[in-house]
């Protein structure tokens, strides 16, 4: 039995289109093999009409195509301008026509309903606008023009040129009579409803000389587009509703079991709390189109979504909509990473951000989700080294551990840092993820001086105290710059058994700058890591001043001043609109922190993690 499945019977009418979906098990082989649509002949052979390799038979030229959707094991054959000659037996299949996996489909094209001669057919989506054209002869130019709807054997007046409007069409219909010489009037119906579907009759004049024209109006509900995304990943709904609603409030809603539609987000500021921190409504273009991005997809996000336009910011009958059916794949390619990371005031967090491992060269970004209005995500840092000014000295994006994960470190935490952050790249948009930073009670594990003033030409030692639980971790000092944090050369770390036993006197790693130069001014981080995985960090700012007194200077935590005040951002720094999320190259204008000079190098800077006694200080 073939695992390929589709509709056994498809019926339609002349002039119409069909869209035949065939389903197959989405194994790796099936996804990439040839897909075909062929017609069975009397001889039993099946002649290819269209295939996924681009072949289209002459009979189908310009009216058919085959589209494969490998991620969800579907391919679709669209055939337009059907004629009765298209009736017959077909196969949709994979591989070779004669011996591949296939499914039999019977297509029947009939003449269609008996419409009055000369009937014009209008096919329009619900919520859109239709313009019905009604010709008339010169002698009927001064006479009454009208549009009727045929319901069974009766005709119901819809609108006429004497200002009558049927209540069912109130505020959404108009009859236009052109200037002299043009022998056609038009009826425009906006915000079409399903109930508008049917046969209409245009009439000009009365009696035996009247002009009549039939119009068949077919109002279609939008076919939901299948969207198949990975758990923990991201989805983007692109919504293009047309210029006629460009200035009307927009929304995205999710259909519930009662068949009503709950607003997920709209341009009037409403947002479902279930999507807090993981949704953005990108500003609309001039044509009224907009998009909604949802990250951190959960199984419960599955469902039918509609986007639309209405002044109330929610679904109303007869307004244009677009539909999607979202399926969330639990066999996700996106690795699990913490959705909540906790840090203490004054401490730090190291956030692991997944990206598509096939895109190791892509630019990496980290932005702060802001919920105001439609939501936006101003960039804080990127892998090329741009960092927003108020994060100078306390934020860094590292390419490690690599192979599908990068790391973002944020230290000197305050309660203001609590919130939602997004990890993204300029590559695969489905890999956007969200992490929430929570600030909890507690003390930082790493202790460094608040700030340090070093004297030009002298020696500076900066201690960093760590608790026993970090004894097996690698300790490091690095000099922060807007392009990362350059690890400083390390001296011999002293007897290793001191760390194994976690001797009271060994819980110290010190940075030595000798001699201090102007280039040494800036931020330094003390940190712990395990291999390529970063743990806590602590930051200290070193200011350099002219020599006042001779001798080396040792700074212990007791003598350290308070941390320097954060630099205040000048109001000219542009906030990044959500739109930039679509194309991270738009971030290039973001204000850049001035480079903090040459890295401390050579033997001038060294890290020493021998005991604090040897440094001539004490450690609590």
């Amino acid at each position: 039995k073939s695992p390929v499945f589709g509709p056994q019977e498809v019926s339609s009418v002349e002039g119409n289109s069909v869209s035949i979906k065939c389903y197959y098990p989405p194994t790796s082989v099936n996804r990439h093999t040839r897909k075909y649509w062929c017609r069975k002949g009397a001889s039993g052979r099946c002649i290819t009409l269209v295939s996924s390799e681009g072949y289209v038979s002459s009979n189908y030229a310009g009216r058919a195509n085959l589209t494969n959707f490998p991620e969800n094991g579907t391919f679709v054959v669209n055939i337009a301008q059907l004629s009765r000659d298209d009736s017959g037996h077909y196969k949709c299949g994979l591989g070779i026509n004669s011996r591949g996996l296939s499914f039999d489909v019977s297509l029947e094209v009939s003449q269609g309903p008996e419409l009055p001669n000369g009937t014009e057919v209008y096919t329009v989506d619900v919520g859109r606008t239709v313009t019905i054209k009604c010709p008339f002869k010169t002698e009927n130019a001064p006479k009454t023009k009208a549009l009727y709807k045929k319901i069974g054997q009766t005709s119901v007046l819809v609108i006429d040129s004497r200002n009558y409007v049927n209540p069912n069409y109130k505020d959404r219909i108009r009859l236009r009579i052109p200037g002299t010489g043009q022998l056609i009037f038009t009826v425009v119906i906006d915000r079409l409803r399903l109930s508008d579907h049917g046969l209409y009759l245009c009439q000009a004049g009365d009696g035996s000389n009247r002009d009549e024209k039939n119009a068949d109006l077919q109002v279609l509900e939008p076919e939901p587009e299948l969207v198949y995304e990975d758990l923990r990943g991201s989805v983007t709904f692109h919504c293009a509703l047309g210029l006629e609603v460009a200035n009307v409030a927009k929304f995205l809603c999710r259909v519930n079991s009662r068949e009503t539609c709950d607003v997920v987000i709209n341009t009037l500021g409403k947002r479902d709390s279930a999507f807090e921190g993981r949704i953005l409504l990108n500003p609309q273009d001039k044509d009224g189109s907009f998009s909604v991005v949802i990250t951190g997809l959960r199984k419960e996000d599955e469902g039918r979504y509609l986007c639309g336009a209405h002044s109330d910011g929610q679904l109303q009958e007869g307004w244009p909509i677009q539909a999607w059916q979202l399926f969330v794949n639990e066999e996700s390619t996106i690795p699990r990473s913490p959705t909540v990371v906790k840090g203490v005031a004054g401490g730090s967090v190291a956030v692991l951000c997944p990206y598509n491992p096939k895109e190791s060269q892509s630019l990496k970004y980290w932005c702060l989700w802001e919920g105001a209005q439609n939501g936006r995500c101003p960039l804080l840092v990127e892998s090329q080294g741009l960092v927003q000014e108020q994060y100078e000295g306390r934020l860094s994006l590292l390419q490690e551990p690599g192979n599908g994960t990068f790391t973002v470190i944020l230290n000197q935490l305050t309660t203001q840092d609590a919130g939602f952050y997004w990890c993204l790249t300029n590559g695969d948009t489905r890999w956007r993820t969200t992490v929430e930073i929570k600030i909890i009670e507690g003390e930082p594990n790493l202790k460094v001086p608040g700030n340090v003033t070093a004297v030009l030409g002298e020696t500076l030692n900066i201690p960093c105290h760590f608790p026993c639980k970090f004894s097996s971790y690698e300790k490091y000092w690095c000099k922060w710059s807007n392009t990362g944090c350059q690890t400083l050369p390390s001296q011999d770390e002293g007897p290793s058994e001191a760390f194994v036993n976690c001797d009271e006197n060994s819980r110290l790693v010190s940075l030595t700058l000798n001699p201090v130069t102007r280039a040494d001014e800036g931020w330094y981080w003390c940190g712990v890591k395990q291999g390529h995985f970063y743990g806590e960090t602590a930051a200290v700012y070193v200011a350099v001043e002219e020599k006042k007194v001779a001798g080396s200077r040792y700074v212990s935590p007791a003598k350290a001043d308070a941390a320097p005040d954060e630099k205040v951002l000048d109001s000219g720094v542009r906030e990044i609109e959500n739109k930039a999320i679509q194309d991270p190259r738009l971030f290039a204008e973001e204000k850049v922190v001035a480079d903090t000079g040459d890295q401390a190098g050579g033997s001038r800077a060294s890290v020493d993690s021998s005991s604090s006694e040897e440094q001539g200080g004490s450690s609590k």
Partner: nanobody, 126 residues
Framework: QVQLVESGGGWVQTGGSLRLSCAAS????????MGWFRQTPGKEREFVAA??????????YYTDSAKGRFTISRDNAKNTVYLQMNSLKPEDTAVYYC?????????????????WGQGTQVTVSS
């Protein structure tokens, strides 16, 4: 939500025929797959047939065992879907359910718990 009410079940001898009806209310079901499923005691519900339509095009889906014997159809004006079952066999004995779901993806799966009828019993005796 779509309310679905099945009828037409009953007792019939092998080779006989039955016509099941599924009346939908609550909204028009033009954007839905309307499916028939069946269930025998201790077993999972299994797909029998489904129908969908877009404008004046109709798509009918059947399981292998139903092909050639069962016909699914609809009456738009009555918002009703039918399953004409001919050449019935004892193995067709089951409770038959009508179900509805948005017209997207494979019509054999992912029917929402809310959009099922209460079922109608079909018994085929030899």
């Amino acid at each position: 939500q779509v309310q679905l009410v099945e009828s037409g079940g009953g007792w019939v001898q092998t080779g006989g025929s039955l016509r099941l009806s599924c009346a939908a209310s609550g909204r028009t079901v033009s954007s839905y797959y309307m499916g028939w499923f069946r269930q025998t005691p201790g077993k999972e519900r299994e797909f029998v047939a489904a129908i969908s339509w877009v404008g004046s095009s109709t798509y009918k889906y059947y399981t292998d065992s139903a092909k050639g014997r069962f016909t699914i159809s609809r009456d738009n004006a009555k918002n009703t879907v039918y399953l004409q079952m001919n050449s019935l066999k004892p193995e067709d004995t089951a409770v038959y359910y009508c179900a509805a779901r948005p017209r997207v993806g494979d019509p054999r799966s992912r029917y929402d718990d809310d959009n099922w009828g209460q079922g109608t019993q079909v018994t085929v005796s030899s």
